[in-house]
């Protein structure tokens, strides 16, 4: 007789998790020598240990501690890159600004990147078939929890300029619904930022409005300000060309005014 | 650009110093204060944008004060010590576009006005 | 923030020589560095702006080079006038003030 299984609104775990998981660890600690200490075995018992055999609707912090703790790592702690809504081109910038750094240029955020996955209450298995919806289902989901304490440990870490990069074309530019908003806004450490600096992505070719006009850049700038953190914001009008800049600073059309 | 209101002062009094422009539109340029101290370099204090916005050295933060009015910007020096003996300069930042973003550079600066605090 | 550090604090150069100074910031400004000059009793004056463009009136023996973090000016065939102290600047964010100039670096003419 099949075993009534819990069918929940969202996907499932996605396919050859352990695997991957397991094959991201081996590929981020041979590229990273800093991070060649670590054991991906370990790092894959931790990162199961957090979520098996528990009801994925009551997942906690706690639960990830383990894992927390084997990947602990050191990044610049000014030269960290925050994100909402613009994950591609954040990424896409700090593979050419080598030396900057977003939560998913980490070990752990590198491990979880697009990945959804699951468990079931008492029983060891992987549930492959659905997963607990943020919305529809429940917020202590482990994907959510996953990604909640891995943000508020990376804001935490913050210092001097933090620089978050935020997407001009969505009609809410800053979301306080966001991990962004929700998380890493607040667990940035007054004492240690300086200032907070968002980049408005503008999309439109030839759109030269000021965005950082917008009312919830507005809403962002009130919320650090409180907080005892200078903001300022600025807008990358064109994208592609500013990592073509990036990339490029010495050619002829990134050194003369437009 | 000419600033105004530099003078001696007594540790403690509250000066101020008046930034008048003509031929400029201040609600479309930024207008920055920027300090020199005798046979020192150049220190910015703060910075009055066209819509407002003022942003202040974290150093100056409590001890200076900027508002504008149509034609000019002000400098409230709030309890001046010895250590704000110094030229005082303002200048016009003016934005411009380049690598698909923009950035700014202060391209008129007044004569500057002095300011000596002494007991 | 970004802070500016200028090398060298002073440099002496003869008449018809080349001067380099030096400008490091803390984090990438992405091409946005000004370079001033100001001679004594006088305000700062802009000489280039965007890292190498020239400002009105400049003449063309002063360079300005270099993007990221690093930021180089070069006065070739260098004439008396020249004699002044030249500032670098971040213009990538005027929000973020200090430490936004760099200590300064005084050319001698001899």
């Known amino acids: 007789v099949p075993r009534w299984r819990q069918q929940w609104s969202g996907p499932g775990t996605t396919k050859r998790f352990p695997e991957t998981v397991l094959a991201r660890c081996v590929k981020y600690t041979e590229i990273h020598p800093e991070m060649r200490h670590v054991d991906c075995q370990s790092v894959w018992d931790a990162f199961k240990g957090a979520f098996i055999s528990k009801h994925p609707c009551n997942i906690t912090e706690e639960d990830y501690q383990p894992l927390m703790k084997l990947g602990t790592q050191t990044v610049p702690c000014n030269k960290i890159l925050l994100w909402s809504r613009i994950k591609d081109l954040a990424h896409q910038f700090t593979q050419v600004q080598r030396d900057m750094f977003t939560l998913e240029d980490t070990l752990l955020g590198y491990l979880a990147d697009d990945l959804t996955w699951c468990g079931e209450f008492n029983t060891s298995k992987i549930n492959y078939q659905s997963c607990p919806d943020w919305r529809k289902d429940c917020s202590n989901n482990p994907v959510s929890v996953f990604w909640k304490t891995v943000s508020r440990r990376f804001a935490e870490a913050a210092c001097d300029v933090v620089h978050v990069m935020l997407n001009g074309s969505r009609s809410k530019i800053f979301d306080k619904n966001s991990t962004f908003g929700s998380v890493e806004v607040h667990n940035l450490q007054p004492e240690k930022v300086q200032t907070l600096e968002a980049w408005v992505i503008h999309g439109g070719r030839e759109d030269s409005r000021d965005l950082c006009q917008d009312p919830t850049i507005k809403e962002l700038e009130s919320i650090i300000s409180k907080r005892n953190i200078q903001f300022s914001c600025k807008n990358i009008y064109r994208p592609d060309k500013f990592l073509q800049c990036v990339k490029n600073p010495e050619d002829s059309s990134c050194t003369s005014e437009i | 650009v000419e600033e105004s209101g530099g003078r001696l002062v007594t540790p403690g009094t509250p000066l101020t110093l008046t930034c008048t422009v003509s031929?400029?539109?201040?609600?479309?340029?930024?207008m920055g204060w920027v300090r020199q101290a005798p046979g020192k370099g150049l220190k910015y204090i703060g910075i009055?944008?066209?819509?407002?916005n003022i942003y202040y050295a974290n150093w100056a933060k409590g001890r200076f004060t900027i508002s504008k009015t149509s034609t000019t910007v002000d400098l409230r020096i709030t309890s001046p010590t010895t250590e704000d003996t110094a030229t005082y300069f303002c200048a016009r930042e003016r934005e411009f576009y380049g690598g698909g973003t923009s950035g700014s550079r202060l391209d008129l600066w007044g004569q500057g006005t002095l300011v000596t605090v002494s007991s | 923030a970004y802070d500016m550090t200028q090398t060298p604090a002073s440099v002496e150069a003869a008449v018809g020589g080349t001067v380099t100074i030096k400008c490091q910031a803390s984090?990438?400004?992405?091409?946005?560095l000004n370079w001033y000059q100001q001679k004594p009793g006088q305000p700062p004056k802009l000489l280039i702006y965007y890292a190498s463009t020239l400002a009105f009136g400049v003449p063309s023996r002063f360079k300005g080079s270099g993007s990221g973090t690093e930021y180089t000016l070069t006065i070739s065939g260098v004439e008396s006038a020249d004699a002044a102290t030249y500032y670098c600047q971040q213009g990538w964010n005027s929000g973020i003030l200090d430490n936004s100039f760099g200590g300064g670096t005084e050319v001698v003419v001899k």
């Open positions: 009055m944008t066209s819509g407002g």
């Open positions: 031929g400029i539109d201040l609600n479309s340029y930024a």
């Open positions: 984090q990438s400004i992405y091409n946005f």
